[in-house]
Interface confidence: medium
């Protein structure tokens, strides 16, 4: 017997050949499928671990598999060797025994060389499959170890290009923070110089402050003078008025009796036969106290008493309480008539206000108040209006209800602030409101954008500075 | 709160319309004027137009007289501009802004704008 050989046919059987001679025995064994080793049991459902096992655990059992091939395989050699023995002693009593009983000698021996070869091929097979096994799940751990080595790689690769750019970022906010810093330096610098420039011109300005107060504890004790030299021409005027009353009434007692008349406001001087526009004097009601007021006695069926005029700037309107009460100007120019006559007239019987408007385009507007008086000065003279009607504004520029009026010396507006001082002038202030016509007057080209300045919101809006106002009142049955 | 919320921008060719709309919340929106600035890419603001309390009276810039027209509706707290003939300076961001009584002529709230982009 020459050879012993072991291959796969075109089906997948093993075969087994045994050369004697002129003669080959083939032996076909049947594959020994989906045998497993109950020592090593195979799940074929089991989950698949997220992380592969550690490397080195993986290493320790190929090398156990290695070996235990490396038995397998000095077993099967033995096998083969203790085969071809037996084989050589069959064949020697084959050849001593008849040719005719060699058939039957060479069943016998193939039955046993079959059943033999058939044990040991169903253990290679299950030690084949096992080691299959084990390197098919070591080849899928090796690899999944692989795809989580790469994935770990790529994120560190990202995250260092992320720490590079932040690098960049924070380098590039550094800079800037210092550049800032340095800027910022450079500015306070800059603060402190004009801090100190402003101090030299505050001190400066205190200085000019001081000669001006000077100049007008100067101009006060004059002007004081003036009054006084005043007082007493207008004393010597009565005196020369009188006198000629006196030698008039003697010639004319008609005249006499019509000079005593007084009259309360200027509807009664219209209604007296007096319709020309001018001065004239009031009385104050109950009262023998005097005052002068301009009478228009042409616009709207005249009659009207005139209690504020602004028309050129030249009387300053930021004035005390007292000044507002009694009234301050000059009658035929820009004038205050005085709250408390008007308190005292407008309680007396019910008043109309009327308020014309004059921009600087040549634009003339009014708002006429059907009902109008003035608390008296307990109540901070306080306005009261009713029925709105006119072109300038739908909405009364006077806020509603009432308020308090108020002045430099007396703030009674609803604002935290001091709207007399701020806004400059009297008025009645809400907080600080919509109007005020006694505000600083401004020239043409210098009336836009005037928080202080002479304003009807709802004709103008809040930065126009007005050129004229007058505001006069009426009875209403007149 | 005062608050001002303009809506309406949006793309539009050369030629075209767009109508503005500046909804008013948290003060007596009848009383007050009105008033539309606008500001371009890069540039400062300019004022674009106004209208008194009532809507009797309106104002506008020389550069958009004729082709925009400011209006107020008090009973929906609404203002708007309705802007046509658009040409491509007039891509602007639009900011619609309340005048307060004391603010000489100055604005003491504003909107968060709508951007309008006049493009071919």
């Known amino acids: 017997y020459n050879n012993f050989r072991k291959s796969m046919d075109s089906i997948g059987k093993k075969q087994y050949q045994v050369q004697h001679g002129s003669c080959s025995y083939t032996f076909l064994l049947p594959e020994m499928d989906n045998c497993r080793s109950s020592s090593s049991p195979y799940v074929s459902n089991a989950v698949q671990r997220d992380a592969p096992l550690e490397y080195d655990d993986s290493v320790q059992r190929l090398q156990v598999l290695e070996n235990i091939m490396e038995n397998n395989t000095q077993w099967l050699m033995k096998l083969e060797n203790y085969i071809q023995d037996n084989m050589k002693k069959e064949m020697v009593e084959i050849q001593q025994n008849a040719v005719q009983n060699q058939t039957a000698v060479m069943i016998e021996i193939g039955t046993n060389l079959l059943n033999q070869t058939a044990e040991q091929t169903r253990k290679l097979t299950d030690v084949e499959a096992q080691v299959l096994n084990q390197t098919t799940r070591l080849e899928l751990q090796l690899l999944e170890h692989s795809l989580s080595t790469n994935k770990l790689e790529k994120q560190i690769l990202d995250q260092t290009s992320e720490i590079n750019k932040l690098q960049d970022k924070n380098s590039f906010l550094e800079k800037k923070v210092l550049a800032m810093e340095d800027k910022h330096i450079i500015q306070l610098q800059s603060i402190k110089e004009e801090k100190d420039q402003l101090q030299v011109l505050v001190s400066k300005q205190n200085s000019i402050i001081e000669e001006l107060e000077k100049k007008i504890v100067t101009a006060t004790v004059n002007n004081s003078v003036l009054q006084k030299q005043q007082h007493d021409l207008m004393e010597t005027v009565n005196n020369l008025l009188t006198m000629m009353s006196t030698s008039n009434s003697a010639k004319d007692p008609t005249v006499a009796k019509e000079e005593q008349i007084s009259f309360r406001d200027c509807a009664e001087v219209f209604k007296s036969g007096h319709t020309t526009n001018g001065i004239y004097t009031l009385t104050f009601p109950n009262s023998t106290e005097e005052i002068k007021a301009y009478c228009d006695m042409e616009a709207g069926g005249g009659g009207w008493t005139i209690i504020q005029r602004r028309e050129d700037g030249s009387v300053d309107f930021q004035r005390t309480w007292k000044e507002y009460k009694v009234g301050f100007g000059n009658p035929s120019g820009e004038y205050w008539l005085g709250n408390e006559f008007v308190s005292q007239l407008t309680n007396q019987q019910r008043y109309v206000l009327k308020i014309h408007l004059k921009d600087w385009e040549g634009n003339e507007a009014y708002s006429l108040y059907e009902h109008f008086y003035l608390s008296s000065e307990e109540l901070n003279y306080r306005i009261h209006l009713k029925g709105l009607t006119g072109t300038a504004g739908k909405i009364s520029s006077i806020s509603q209800p009432g308020n308090d009026f108020s002045t430099k010396d007396g703030d009674n507006d609803k604002c935290i602030c001091k709207c007399s001082q701020m806004l400059t002038g009297g008025w009645w202030f809400d907080a600080c409101g919509p109007s005020n016509l006694n505000g600083m007057y401004y020239p043409q080209r210098q009336n836009t954008n005037k928080f202080n300045g002479i304003k009807w919101y709802y004709w103008k809006g809040s930065g126009y500075s007005l050129k004229a106002t007058t505001m006069m009142i009426r009875p209403a049955d007149f | 709160q005062v608050q001002l919320v303009e809506s309406g921008g949006g793309l539009v060719q050369p030629g075209g319309s767009l109508r503005l709309s500046c909804a008013a919340s948290g003060f007596t929106f009848s009383s007050y004027w009105m008033h539309w600035v606008r500001q371009a890419p890069g540039k400062g603001l300019v004022w674009v137009s106004r209208i008194n309390s009532d809507g009797s009276s309106t104002s506008y810039a020389d550069s958009v007289k004729g082709r925009f027209t400011i209006s107020r509706d008090n009973a929906k707290n609404t203002l708007y501009l309705q802007m046509n003939s658009l040409r491509a300076e007039d891509t602007a961001v639009y900011y619609c802004?309340?005048?307060?009584?004391?603010?000489?002529?100055?604005?003491?709230?504003w909107g968060q704008g709508t951007l309008v982009t006049v493009s071919s």
């Open positions: 802004a309340r005048e307060g009584y004391s603010s000489g002529g100055q604005f003491d709230y």
